[in-house]
C-alpha cells in the first residue's frame, strides 16, 4: 500500500475472491443461456 501502514495480503485475498465471484457469475450466465437455447 502507498501509505505503508498495511501489508498487501488482505487486498490480494479480496481480489482473488472478486475474480472467483466474477468467473462464477460469467459461467453461471453461460450455463443458463445454454439451457435456455436447448
Amino acid at each position: 500500500h502507498s501509505d505503508g501502514i498495511f501489508t498487501d495480503s488482505y487486498s490480494r485475498y479480496r481480489k482473488q475472491m472478486a475474480v472467483k465471484k466474477y468467473l462464477a457469475a460469467v459461467l453461471g450466465k453461460r450455463y443458463k443461456q445454454r439451457v435456455k437455447n436447448k
Epitope: I5, D8, S9, Y10, R14, M17, K20
Partner: antibody, heavy 108, light 112 residues
Framework: AEGGLVKPGGSLELCCKA??????????MCWVRQAPGKGLNWIGC????????DYATWVDAQFTLSRDIDQNTGCLQLNSLTPADTAMYYC??????WGQGTLVTVSS | AQVLTQTPSSVSAAVGGTVTINCQSS???????LSWFQQKPGQPPKFLIY???KLASGVPSRFSGSGSGTQFTLTISGVQCSDAATYYC?????????????FGGGTEVVVK
C-alpha cells in the same frame, strides 16, 4: 464510534473514522464483536472502494454495513437489538489496524 | 459453516519457556490466509502473523507461525511476561461457498 445503552428492539449506528491515512480501494473495513468474557466474532466486511459487503451467516440481515470514502468513514447499523447483542464492537481495516472498540449494552 | 478449533483453551508457561498453540480449520482456509492475533484485557486485538507464517511489522521474532490447509500453529519461544494474553487465529475462506471469515475460540496464555 459511539456506543452506549440501548433498549431491546432498538437500533444503533456505530461509525468508525480512519485517521492518518486515506481509505482506498485496497482497504476493507471489517467489524468484529466480543461479548463480555467471550471470544471474537466476525460480523462482516465492506470494501472502501466498491461498497460491496459480505456478512457472517448468523447476521441474517440484522446488521448493515456502509461506508463513505470521502469522509474516510465506515458504519455498522445495528437493528432489532436483544440482550444477546451486548458486546464490545470493533472496527478494523484489513484486520491489521484496529479501533479501540465501543461497548454496546442492550437492556431494558 | 466453517469451524476453527483452537487448542489448548489455556496454557501456562514459565518465563523463557516455549508455548505452542494449535488452530485446526474445517474446511481448509483459502491459500494459507490464516492470521494470528494477541489480545490483552481491555484492549483491541493486535495483528501478529498473516498468511500462516509472516510476521507483522514490529512483532518480536520470538513469535512464529506455521502450517497450511487445515492445521496451523503459533509458537512463542522464550516467553516473556508481556506475552500473557489471549491469542486468536482467524481464517479466510472461499467466500462463494461459505462465510469469508471465522475466528478460533482463543487460547489464554498465563506466564509464571
Amino acid at each position: 464510534a459511539e456506543g452506549g445503552l440501548v433498549k431491546p428492539g432498538g437500533s444503533l449506528e456505530l461509525c468508525c473514522k480512519a485517521s492518518g491515512f486515506s481509505l482506498t480501494t485496497s482497504h476493507w473495513m471489517c467489524w468484529v464483536r466480543q461479548a463480555p468474557g467471550k471470544g471474537l466474532n466476525w460480523i462482516g466486511c465492506i470494501s472502501a472502494g466498491s461498497g460491496d459487503a459480505d456478512y457472517a451467516t448468523w447476521v441474517d440481515a440484522q446488521f448493515t454495513l456502509s461506508r463513505d470514502i470521502d469522509q474516510n468513514t465506515g458504519c455498522l447499523q445495528l437493528n432489532s437489538l436483544t440482550p444477546a447483542d451486548t458486546a464490545m464492537y470493533y472496527c478494523t481495516i484489513n484486520f491489521e489496524l484496529w479501533g479501540q472498540g465501543t461497548l454496546v449494552t442492550v437492556s431494558s | 459453516a466453517q469451524v476453527l478449533t483452537q487448542t489448548p483453551s489455556s496454557v501456562s508457561a514459565a518465563v523463557g519457556g516455549t508455548v505452542t498453540i494449535n488452530c485446526q480449520s474445517s474446511p481448509s482456509v483459502y491459500s494459507s490466509y490464516l492470521s494470528w492475533f494477541q489480545q490483552k484485557p481491555g484492549q483491541p486485538p493486535k495483528f501478529l502473523i498473516y498468511e500462516a507464517s509472516k510476521l507483522a511489522s514490529g512483532v518480536p521474532s520470538r513469535f512464529s507461525g506455521s502450517g497450511s490447509g487445515t492445521q496451523f500453529t503459533l509458537t512463542i519461544s522464550g516467553v516473556q511476561c508481556s506475552d500473557a494474553a489471549t491469542y486468536y487465529c482467524l481464517g479466510a475462506y472461499d467466500c462463494g461457498r461459505t462465510d469469508c471469515h471465522a475466528f478460533g475460540g482463543g487460547t489464554e496464555v498465563v506466564v509464571k
